[in-house]
């Protein structure tokens, strides 16, 4: 990265992350930079690469929906890190002004 | 309140076609994914088919791959269900269903679908 | 696609605990729902994400889900309890899939 930026999701991953694995996602929003929107994905593990998905498709909805009700243990990391789960070629977004992170609200049960 | 109901069911001949309603009132109608659930006299629940907020992506279960197809219109408040090649098999009450996460917590009362000749 | 087996009926006297099992290969990594459903009514909910119970449902039902099952338990199970039971769980495809049902029975 240069001067620190970091790179923008410029592909969705293929492979799905199952629910019980995930901590927690952030928006990516091509409104702040990047050229693509995209939902990112992180994992229990930190040591796991995030994974970029469609905020189109149906079980990235799901899983979204799910962590928004869901009451969070812990907040997701600071910033927007590169997503080495996905292929990225092309144009970066600079800095983290490409991501915007959602993290769980505390709402009572049911919607 | 919250309400989703079933329309369109009936009566229809083996390898006709049918296409149930389900019209929704007091929430957000594309905020939610929605999906079809049926029943068979008798029988258990089966999940049918799932369509995603806006209508991009869909899910069907093998039994009505090809033959059934879900659809929405969120400027309506209404999900669809297209079915078609419609076999004595397919006969049962079918319900439409609002998803929540993993979870489907709003159900319609159910629209009867009897395939028969 | 998961298959989900659940008992096809089970039995107990008003205030006995009951429990119902789901059982799945690996249904432990998914979420995993269970549906009430009496006579002539649609289905209602009363718990997902395995083991959380939406407003509304008694606090004598709860959830588990670990490994290849996943129980529902009634604990001092009422009359009005008496309902077919179906145990839910979406997979990564996503496509969903219901338990067969189980019919449980107060004595």
């Known amino acids: 990265s240069d001067g620190g930026a970091q790179d923008c999701c410029l592909k969705y991953s293929q492979r799905k992350i199952p629910a019980k694995v995930v901590r927690s996602y952030r928006k990516q929003e091509p409104s702040l930079g990047c050229s693509i929107p995209a939902i990112l994905f992180l994992p229990r593990k930190r040591s796991q690469a995030e994974l970029c998905a469609d905020p189109k498709e149906l079980w990235v909805q799901q899983l979204m929906q799910h962590l928004d009700k869901t009451p969070s243990p812990q907040k997701p990391a600071q910033g927007c890190r590169k997503d080495r789960g996905a292929s990225k070629t092309g144009k970066k977004g600079k800095g983290s002004k490409g991501c915007k992170r959602t993290e769980r609200s505390q709402t009572p049960k049911g919607p | 309140q919250v309400q989703l109901v079933e329309s369109g069911g009936g009566l229809v001949q083996p390898g006709g076609s049918l296409r149930l309603s389900c019209a929704a009132s007091?929430?957000?109608?594309?905020?939610?994914?929605m999906s079809w659930v049926r029943q068979a006299p008798g029988k258990g629940l089966e999940w049918v088919s799932a369509?995603?907020?806006?209508?991009?992506?869909?899910s069907y279960a093998d039994s009505v791959k090809g033959r059934f197809t879900i659809s929405r219109d969120n400027s309506k408040n209404t999900l669809y269900l297209q079915m078609n090649s419609l076999r004595a098999e397919d006969t049962a009450v079918y319900y439409c269903?609002?998803?929540?996460?993993?979870?489907?917590?709003?159900w319609g009362q159910g629209t009867l679908v009897t395939v028969s000749s | 696609d998961i298959e989900l087996t659940q008992p096809p009926s089970v039995s107990g006297s008003p205030g006995q605990s009951i429990t119902i099992s789901c059982s799945g290969d690996?249904?432990?990594?998914?979420?995993a729902s269970w549906y009430q459903q009496k006579p002539g009514q649609a289905p209602v909910v009363v718990i997902y994400d395995d083991n959380e119970r939406p407003s509304g449902i008694p606090e004598r039902f709860s959830g588990s889900n670990s490994g290849n099952t996943a129980t529902l338990t009634i604990s001092g199970t009422q009359a009005e309890d008496e309902a077919d039971y179906y145990c839910g769980s979406w997979d990564s495809n996503p496509t969903h899939v219901f338990g067969g049902g189980t019919k449980l029975t107060v004595l």
């Open positions: 690996s249904i432990g990594s998914q979420y």
């Open positions: 369509i995603s907020m806006e209508g991009y992506s869909k």
């Open positions: 007091g929430f957000t109608f594309n905020s939610y994914s």
């Open positions: 269903a609002r998803g929540y996460g993993y979870y489907f917590d709003v």
